[in-house]
Interface confidence: medium
């Protein structure tokens, strides 16, 4: 069995691809024959799914290299650190070469035990085709966000709530230590493996897999709001505003604003992901009578999505309508 | 497999009380509207009420406000439909139903529960 | 309370033939309009929600249109196993209204 695949590369060149690069294997034990690479889509971290970005100036900073998301509060000024004795916002200190050496020992010696314990050989499945990755994105994305059709099956459970396990997929690649793997989901964290195999393959397996981690980019377009902008009255001089999710968002969509007026649109309410995923749209309350305007805007994981056409609504001085909703 | 399951048949008598169960399964029970529909024998469908089992938000159709209480365990993934006291007319199959993949109550059910047979009479 | 009118009540068909259900409500709902299928002794089945939009693993020949107060359901092609009561549900207000219900049989 050959020793794992080396200096595992992946960058993004697209929203929907990653390209992979390595090295051989130092130790090929034969002729190196193709290797195998499996790719899974990592779940979001579940703080986003519970935080309320409506409730607290909070946004989330977006770091490509490593497909981490932390969040900061806006509010506070940044952490100011102790650099050479000096007070004040700097860069951290520069890594001395054995620092530098430590810590990528650390980092090969992390990967090659995670190895150790995911898959110590790897046996490649004969025959596999690799499948379209859509038909799992499709049947793994929220199932609120269709609007044509309904899921495929009832045996999903909706990845918003979970933190879900998602499918790894494969394909072999010969004679190359490069490839690009494509129709992935925009700005969202995936798994790359790389297994070595050789000659012996098919008797003995391949290699255990060397990973790595790499976001796609964002797609232009990708957190607009789909279809129109519905509206219907409520009692008390309120009403409902009904949108449709983005299908397929840069990661998540994490709240929506709505910028709405009478004569400009100067008034702003936030919906958070929680009541848009009970309710589908949001309430307006305490409209004086008239004719308004409204606008929506999606914010996701990798910034905000253009603003609706405008929905023009009106209302009246009195409604007698049935209860309604919230 | 996302699936509801409804409790099993019940015989009554006029003026006890009964909660009828549907437990929810393969879904996240909590972020989903649940409603319960009624169907007299050899009748339509009536739709009696829903629950948004996260915070217990419930609406009721005007003509069974007042006479059923829709209520739901997030713990045991459970919705629940109970009568105070039940009537000879209140004999009817019960379904619970919810709008899973459909996502919101206002594009319809989805999913549904077997049914639970009430028989309420003297 | 809007109300929701289904009709015919019931028709005789043929296989094969085309079938037209209508549902008018009394007030506009916008598209939040649901169409089921009924089988003697079985639960309701979702055909069509937001008006046209088909369910998962319902056959094409169901279809829906139609947006503010008039719906309609059709089968473009009836099989022997869409003898069955279809009712229409309307869904934007505090509460929901199913229609009287269709009783497709068999002509």
């Known amino acids: 069995v050959p020793s794992i695949p080396l200096d595992v590369l992946s960058a993004s060149n697209s929203s929907s691809q990653l390209i992979v690069k390595w090295n051989p294997p130092s130790l090929p034990n034969g002729n190196l024959s193709y290797y195998i690479v499996r790719w899974q889509r990592q779940p979001q971290d579940g703080y986003l799914y519970r935080h309320n970005y409506c409730s607290k100036d909070k946004i989330p900073i977006r770091k490509y290299a490593d497909g981490t998301i932390d969040i900061e509060e806006v509010t506070e000024n940044p952490k100011t650190e102790v650099c050479g004795g000096e007070k004040g916002p700097c860069c951290a200190c520069p890594k001395t070469e054995a620092e530098k050496q430590a810590e990528k020992e650390e980092a090969e010696y992390r990967k090659v035990f995670e190895n150790f314990l995911h898959n110590s050989i790897f046996v490649p499945r004969p025959e596999r085709k690799r499948r379209d990755v859509m038909q799992v994105a499709n049947t793994t994305m929220s199932s609120r966000s269709r609007n044509t059709t309904a899921a495929d099956t009832y045996n999903i459970t909706d990845p918003e709530e979970l933190e879900t396990e998602y499918p790894f997929f494969e394909s072999r690649v010969d004679n190359k230590e490069r490839t690009v793997i494509s129709n992935l989901r925009p700005f969202t964290l995936y798994r790359i493996d790389i297994h070595s195999c050789n000659h012996e393959a098919e008797k003995l397996g391949c290699s255990a897999s060397n990973f790595v981690f790499a976001r796609t980019m964002p797609a232009e377009g990708a957190d607009d709001i789909p279809g129109p902008v519905t509206w219907e009255p409520r009692p008390e001089n309120s009403i409902f505003l009904k949108w449709p999710e983005p299908e397929n968002p840069n990661g998540l969509i994490l709240m929506y604003e709505i910028k709405y007026g009478s004569q400009v649109e100067d008034q702003r309410e936030c919906v958070s992901r929680q009541e848009y995923r009970k309710y589908g749209g949001a309430k307006l309350n305490r409209l004086n009578p008239g004719n308004y305007t409204a606008r929506i805007q999606a914010t996701s994981l990798s910034g905000n999505g253009s603003w609706t056409d405008p929905v023009f609504f009106y209302v009246q001085a009195k409604t007698g309508y049935e209860n309604f909703i919230h | 497999q996302v699936q509801l399951v409804e409790s099993g048949a019940e015989v009554k008598k006029p003026g006890e009380s009964l909660k009828i169960s549907c437990k929810g399964s393969?879904?996240?029970?909590?972020?989903?509207?649940i409603g319960w529909v009624r169907q007299m024998p050899g009748k339509g469908l009536e739709w009696m009420g829903i629950i948004y089992p996260d915070d217990s938000d419930t609406r009721y159709s005007p003509s069974f406000q007042g006479q059923v209480t829709i209520s739901a365990d997030r713990s045991i993934t459970t919705a629940y439909l109970q009568w105070s006291s039940l009537k000879a007319s209140d004999t009817a199959m019960y379904y619970c139903a919810a709008s899973i993949v459909t996502g919101y109550y206002y594009y319809g059910l989805d999913v549904w529960g077997q049914g639970t047979t009430v028989t309420v009479s003297s | 309370a809007i109300q929701l009118t289904q009709s015919p009540s019931s028709l005789s068909a043929s296989v094969g033939d085309r079938v037209t259900i209508t549902c008018r409500a009394s007030?506009?709902?916008?598209?939040?309009v649901a169409w089921y299928q009924q089988k003697p002794d079985k639960g309701p089945k979702l055909l069509i929600f937001?008006?046209?939009t088909l369910q998962s693993g319902v056959p094409s020949r169901f279809s829906g249109s139609g947006s503010g107060t008039d719906f309609t359901l059709t089968i473009s092609s009836l099989q022997p196993e869409d003898f069955a009561t279809y009712y229409c549900q309307k869904y934007n207000s505090d509460y929901s209204t199913f229609g009287g219900g269709t009783k497709v049989e068999i002509k």
């Open positions: 007030q506009d709902i916008s598209n939040y």
């Open positions: 937001a008006a046209s």
């Open positions: 393969g879904y996240s029970f909590s972020n989903y509207w």
